[in-house]
């Protein structure tokens, strides 16, 4: 079938694709091509006030090419989408909208959150920590001996950064007071990280529990943990002036 | 949500003629390409015929021209098969489908029997 | 009209195992290619458009390759869910046409 069907017609060429330009099979003057050669699609292109045919390898974005027996031609994919395999399926949406389930949508749904790169709805992702590595030898001033009051670090790692929605990270660096058995330092024996050490229990009145900073905490999302343990720390400096101090890492 | 319902099979002898409807809800119906599938029991899919959006072009398999009629009512957001001199051959499970280079949304599928 | 062969007919597979279907043209279609499961008693479902180009909610163990006249669907990691007939169909020419379908069951 011609594409032309129901359009005036100033002239067709006699000979089917002799003075036709490109891919068409059959062109007019006024018209353009009318069908195209093999393979090709046939799209309409506005000049001012006239439709023009042409004929095309791929159709252009915004458009999905679709073989019919009589024609091969170029469809308009929805409004809000750039480029489509076909109507229901968009493949990369107009400037404004995001991709979700093959639509476009200006507002992601419930439970997703738009990314602002690739313009798609996504999953939100929530931060994910490893499990608290053990705790670092007792040290003062990098030492682990000649003292009997220092500190110990443990550590633990980030297995998911969080996305724009997502539940920000808890601390992954705590820090508490320790005690050791005093000792003077042995020869050669300054700045040793003895990690074979042993550790002293805690006194009665030495609590070895990490409290978080809340310095640190400010200018973060607050998790229920947190701010228990900022009620924690108040409540216990009362208690307590030898309070152990944790200096925590908000990611 | 896009529903696709098909109704109007049933048992009919050879030579008769039986008419499917397809009725459509949760998209813009006139926005597109319909088609019927078929099935023959334990057998694969099989294309019969595809309308055009606007109704102004229709195409078959070569085995069900002149024999069947696609066509659709945009207003009523229907589609049917006409279905004439039918053949035991013609026993399936017949689909309507949202026909767009791919067949994306089916319906349940109508069970047409051509025996005597 | 474009034939569509796809082998085997029908196969048998543990769960965890993959599985791959062929699908082959009988000329050249280009990446007109789609697949298709069909679940017991139920319609089929377009799962791949484009040779391998998911629909969204299909699992990523599901993928698709080849091009040309040479096609095949790859399952990973088998899963309960997955036992269905599934169907390569090419729209690179009218009329449409689909392969004869790929019975897959659990061992």
């Known amino acids: 079938q011609n594409a032309s069907r129901g359009r005036r017609q100033r002239r067709m060429h006699p000979n089917v694709s002799q003075g036709c330009q490109g891919g068409c099979a059959t062109c007019s003057d006024y018209n353009g091509c009318l069908s195209c050669k093999p393979r090709l699609f046939f799209a309409l292109e506005r000049i001012g006030m006239k439709q023009i045919g042409v004929c095309l390898s791929s159709c252009p974005s915004g458009y999905y090419g679709t073989r019919y027996p009589d024609i091969n031609k170029c469809t308009k994919c929805k409004a809000d989408c750039d480029t489509c395999f076909n109507k229901n399926f968009c493949t990369k949406c107009k400037s404004g909208f995001y991709l979700h389930l093959g639509k476009c949508l200006d507002n992601c749904p419930e439970g997703l959150e738009a990314n602002n790169h690739t313009m798609e709805c996504v999953s939100i992702v929530h931060c994910e920590v490893s499990e608290w590595n053990p705790w670092s030898p007792c040290t003062k001033k990098g030492k682990t001996c000649g003292f009997k009051r220092g500190t110990e670090t443990r550590v633990r790692e980030i297995i998911q950064h969080p996305s724009a929605k997502g539940n920000l990270c808890p601390p992954t660096n705590e820090t508490r007071k320790c005690t050791v058995q005093r000792k003077k330092c042995q020869k050669g024996e300054r700045g040793k990280k003895g990690r074979e050490r042993k550790r002293k229990k805690p006194n009665k009145g030495e609590s070895k529990e990490a409290i978080p900073d809340s310095k640190s905490l400010e200018s973060s999302k607050e998790i229920p943990e947190q701010r228990e343990n900022k009620q924690q720390q108040k409540k216990r400096k009362v208690q307590d002036k030898q309070k152990s101090v944790s200096v925590s890492t908000v990611h | 949500e896009v529903q696709l319902v098909e109704s109007g099979g049933g048992l009919v002898q050879p030579g008769r003629s039986l008419k499917l409807s397809c009725a459509a809800s949760?998209?813009?119906?006139?926005?597109?390409?319909m088609a019927w599938v078929r099935q023959a029991p334990k057998k694969g899919l099989e294309w019969v015929a595809t309308?055009?959006?606007?109704?102004?072009?229709?195409y078959y398999r070569d085995s069900v021209k002149g024999r069947f009629t696609i066509s659709r009512a945009n207003a009523k957001s229907t589609l049917y098969l006409q279905m004439d001199s039918l053949r035991s051959e013609d026993t399936a499970t017949y689909y309507c489908?949202?026909?767009?280079?791919?067949?994306?949304?089916w319906g349940q599928g109508v069970m047409v029997t051509v025996s005597s | 009209d474009i034939q569509m062969t796809q082998s085997p007919a029908s196969l048998s597979a543990s769960l965890g195992e993959t599985v791959t279907i062929e699908c082959r043209a009988s000329?050249?279609?280009?990446?007109?290619l789609a697949w298709y499961q069909q679940k017991p008693g139920n319609s089929p479902q377009l799962l791949i458009y484009?040779?391998?180009s998911l629909i969204h909610g299909v699992p990523s163990r599901f993928s698709g390759s080849g091009s040309g006249t040479q096609f095949s669907l790859k399952i990973n990691n088998l899963q309960s869910e997955d036992v269905a007939s599934y169907f390569c169909?090419?729209?690179?020419?009218?009329?449409?046409?689909f392969g004869a379908g790929t019975k897959l069951e659990l061992k």
């Open positions: 949760g998209f813009t119906f006139s926005d597109y390409d």
């Open positions: 000329e050249d279609i280009y990446s007109d």
């Open positions: 484009d040779v391998n």
């Open positions: 169909q090419q729209y690179d020419n009218y009329p449409n046409t």
């Open positions: 489908a949202t026909h767009d280079k791919t067949f994306d949304y």
């Open positions: 309308i055009i959006y606007d109704g102004s072009r229709t």
